[in-house]
């Protein structure tokens, strides 16, 4: 049967009608409305934006909107005491500082309540020391730095470029080194993509261009000050000192043209390869100090911000299914933002409105869909994905027993390419059907499908005549549901040539410069790459809440285990003695994945065959289906991160924003030969095959026939 | 259109003190670095003061170091050059001019400037 004749509608009110009512001259109405003024978290600006969302949701049509709200730990800087890094002399006598704002773009010269650029939860602190160049600050870096280098960290402020991974990463990475501050830069090599003007006159980043963000190390946990439970009115809050994933030394990033100042007087050891160097015109000498002429100067950081408990809101938007209201189906994406938010998060929100807004339409002419379709306004993601995991941490129970698929709505465009989708494999195939229906908005695939110019332009590595589908990592409000609860997710999103533009992110990422005029002077100007993405989110999420059988694949599980499987045993073979004294097998992580292969294959052709009229079977059939992300959770978690609990992804713990499979076993097997007791190392590397196995296992028999 | 225009000029004796304003129109003053630069009679350019975008550095020339100290009003589009134990030697035209490079660090080329104000040190 259609999905059609399942939730008892006319035709018309299909996926086509849906699609047909999203329309990109609204989407550029609400993201000119969106990104007008600043909607940092904890601010008067955001909660009047969320009661906006909540009444023009009301009015589209969803059957209630709600606001939630929670109080957690926000940082902000302090308003008379500003943020900065000076160079001084031996008397103490400060000779350069770095600016104290961005210089404001056309037409926001009088915009009150811009955030001038910080390290969001940086302590306070006023550190005074020799500076280190460490490059990206990845855990490489320091390993070349200390192990082949011999330079020493410790008491150094150390200086790193953006880029390549999570800057929560770089400040971990250097306080484990020793160091006493992170100054964190933007280099033209990482964000000023060769032959485009700095904005205003094109999209790269200007010298006095600066990326805020936030620096924790939550792993997971949410707000610092109640990891595991919401933070609502009776919440009991750890002390400071017990806060999860806060730094311990000052952080502060800069522009190019600051960066310059620093980097310029270096001393010390030349940079150890081409890698190290960046665009700027200076040495990019490693240190530790400044050369002959300066070297009785130093730096100093002046850090004065603060962190406070501040009330956020959500926006949680409910269209009631028709036939199994208690399945729940959640398109999610954040609403506040570092300053005007033109890519982050607005982009993303506009889209979400749009989908709203055709649901709605649909609503109102007498549709509803098969499942509870859920639609959230997240506050405080730049804060650490606070507002989306308070909300699962006060909705855990129903979540787990009711979540079908979450969908996350972040920023649309990261250029304007192609396609990039990361989501769990049991959504590959729902990706692909859909991208065949859709037309493809790029130049010279006029006619063609959306699947044909994104498998065009970015090819999957391993299957020809495929496109490329990344696995989830974090960084976005998606974390909580599928690291945590296991619930089926995905992303999808405009990006750049990866292969042309080697640049971090896009080059105006959390700058003031991120505006409306960005998006359409420079981006997108007939808003057609969001249309676009509209049409795959709000296609997903239209198939997910709406076909009689969820339209996940357990097959393609079994093919993803098999390739992880093979890479983990591949990274353990390149120590084979260790392997044979330690009695090291991948026998049942093989064996187990094998049997996943099979049950999934038979469950598939019952899935073919079965009696879909049957309301008791097909409730049966698709509880298997939507169970299954949830079997790969382990309760216990994975070592020292207990809120990520996915066993077969997790984020990799080099890089929050890259995903990592069997991340269990990759982390024990982790540098494992510099390691002092060995033969602990290798028994943790055996109970996490162990571990990895029984899941595997475990998971395949939640496939089988049940009785 | 974009403009500077100095103001605030005179005739002073030694050792008092001064301050001249520059009113920028057509452009917004929070976004760039600005210089004082004066020109004395007869002689060529001399270059006086130098302040970034945001305030937070002023460099000055060595011969009116601890006695000129250049200052903005970002919020009235204004430049000011408070000038104390002034000298003959100080007697010039002062002209305010716009640094070149959006939200640079340093002092760098101009490329604008105004029509100039008259300061005499004289007894």
């Known amino acids: 049967k259609s999905s059609n004749e399942a939730t008892n509608i006319t035709p018309k009110h299909n996926m086509k009608a849906f699609l047909d009512e999203l329309k990109a001259e609204n989407i550029k109405k609400f993201l000119y409305n969106f990104t007008q003024i600043p909607h940092l978290a904890g601010t008067e600006q955001n909660f009047q934006l969320a009661k906006q969302i909540q009444s023009q949701w009301k009015e589209f049509g969803l059957d209630s909107v709600e606001l939630a709200h929670y109080d957690v730990l926000l940082s902000y800087p302090n308003k008379t005491h500003p943020n900065y890094i000076s160079i001084i002399n031996e008397d103490g006598n400060e000779i350069f500082n770095t600016s104290l704002f961005e210089p404001p773009p056309p037409g926001y010269e009088n915009v009150s309540d811009i955030v001038p650029p910080f390290s969001a939860f940086s302590p306070q602190g006023m550190p005074e020391g020799d500076l280190v160049y460490v490059n990206y600050a990845r855990t490489e870096d320091f390993f070349k730095l200390e192990r082949d280098m011999k330079i020493n960290c410790s008491g150094k402020i150390v200086i790193a470029r953006y880029g390549k991974v999570f800057r929560g990463n770089k400040v971990k990475n250097a306080q484990l080194a020793g160091a006493k501050g992170v100054i964190l830069y933007s280099d033209p090599a990482d964000y000023f993509a060769p032959g485009v003007k700095s904005y205003p006159d094109g999209w790269n980043l200007p010298g006095g261009g600066v990326q805020r963000g936030n620096i924790l190390n939550l792993n997971g946990a949410g707000d610092p000050l109640t990891p595991g439970y919401p933070a609502n009115e009776y919440a009991y809050r750890r002390g400071i000192a017990e806060a999860v994933g806060l730094p311990s030394i000052p952080v502060h990033p800069i522009g190019y043209y600051d960066a310059q100042k620093l980097l310029e007087k270096m001393g010390g050891s030349a940079p150890p390869d081409s890698s190290w160097r960046g665009s700027l015109k200076v040495p990019y000498n490693v240190g530790p100090g400044f050369t002959g002429n300066f070297s009785t100067q130093k730096v100093k950081m002046h850090i004065h911000s603060t962190n406070e408990v501040t009330r956020i809101y959500n926006v949680i938007g409910t269209l009631r299914g028709a036939v199994e209201p208690d399945r729940y189906v959640i398109l999610g994406g954040h609403r506040d933002s570092w300053v005007f938010g033109g890519i982050d998060p607005q982009s993303g929100a506009a889209v979400v409105h749009e989908i709203v807004r055709s649901f709605g339409t649909l609503k109102k002419e007498g549709w509803r869909p098969r499942r509870t379709i859920l639609f959230a306004s997240w506050d405080a993601e730049e804060f650490g994905l606070l507002g989306s995991t308070e909300w699962a941490e006060e909705n855990s129970r129903l979540l787990q027993e009711r979540g079908v698929a979450y969908i996350n709505a972040d920023s649309s465009i990261e250029g304007n390419y192609t396609l990039r989708v990361d989501c769990t494999p049991l959504m590959y195939s729902l990706v692909h059907n859909l991208t065949k229906e859709l037309k493809s908005p790029d130049e010279g695939f006029e006619g063609k499908s959306l699947y044909e110019s994104w498998t065009k332009k970015s090819p999957s590595p391993e299957f020809s005549g495929m496109p490329r589908i990344s696995k989830l990592g974090s960084g976005n409000d998606f974390e909580v549901f599928f690291q945590r609860l296991g619930i089926a997710s995905g992303r999808a999103r405009y990006t750049k040539n990866w292969e042309t533009n080697k640049f971090s992110g896009y080059p105006l990422y959390h700058s003031v410069y991120e505006t409306y005029e960005l998006v359409e002077k420079f981006y997108d100007p007939m808003f057609k790459y969001h249309l676009t993405v509209a049409q795959v989110r709000g296609g997903m999420v239209f198939e997910l809440a709406n076909s009689i059988v969820l339209p996940f694949d357990c097959r393609d599980y079994a093919v993803v285990l098999r390739k992880y499987a093979d890479k983990i045993y591949s990274i353990s073979m390149k120590h084979p003695q260790e392997m044979k004294t330690y009695s090291v097998s991948f026998d049942s992580l093989f064996s187990a994945v094998k049997n996943f292969t099979e049950i999934a294959s038979k469950f598939s052709e019952r899935l073919q065959d079965f009696d879909k009229s049957n309301p008791i079977v097909l409730r049966m059939m698709n509880d298997q289906l939507m169970f299954l992300e949830r079997a790969f959770i382990d309760p216990l978690g994975l070592p020292d991160r207990p809120f990520y609990r996915h066993v077969i992804y997790a984020p990799s713990s080099h890089n929050k924003y890259a995903g990592e499979s069997f991340p269990g076993i990759y982390d024990a097997l982790f540098d494992i030969e510099s390691k002092v007791d060995p033969s602990k190392a290798w028994g943790e590397v055996k109970r996490q095959i162990y571990v990895a196995a029984f899941t595997v296992q475990a998971a395949a028999e939640t496939l089988s026939e049940v009785a | 259109q974009v403009q500077l225009v100095e103001s605030g000029g005179g005739v002073v004796q030694p050792g008092r003190s001064l301050r001249l304003s520059c009113a920028a129109s057509g452009f917004p003053l929070i976004s760039y670095g600005m210089h004082w630069v004066r020109q004395a009679p007869g002689k060529g350019l001399e270059w006086v003061a130098f302040?970034?975008?945001?305030?937070?550095?002023?460099y000055y020339a060595d011969s009116v170091k601890g006695r000129f100290t250049i200052s903005r009003d970002n919020s009235k589009n204004t430049l000011y050059l408070q000038m104390n134990s002034l000298r003959a030697e100080d007697t010039a035209v002062y002209y305010c001019?716009?640094?070149?490079?959006?939200?640079?660090?340093?002092?760098?080329?101009?490329?604008?400037w105004g029509q100039g104000t008259m300061v005499t040190v004289s007894s």
């Open positions: 001019a716009r640094d070149r490079i959006v939200g640079g660090r340093v002092p760098d080329a101009f490329d604008i």
């Open positions: 302040q970034t975008y945001d305030g937070s550095n002023r």
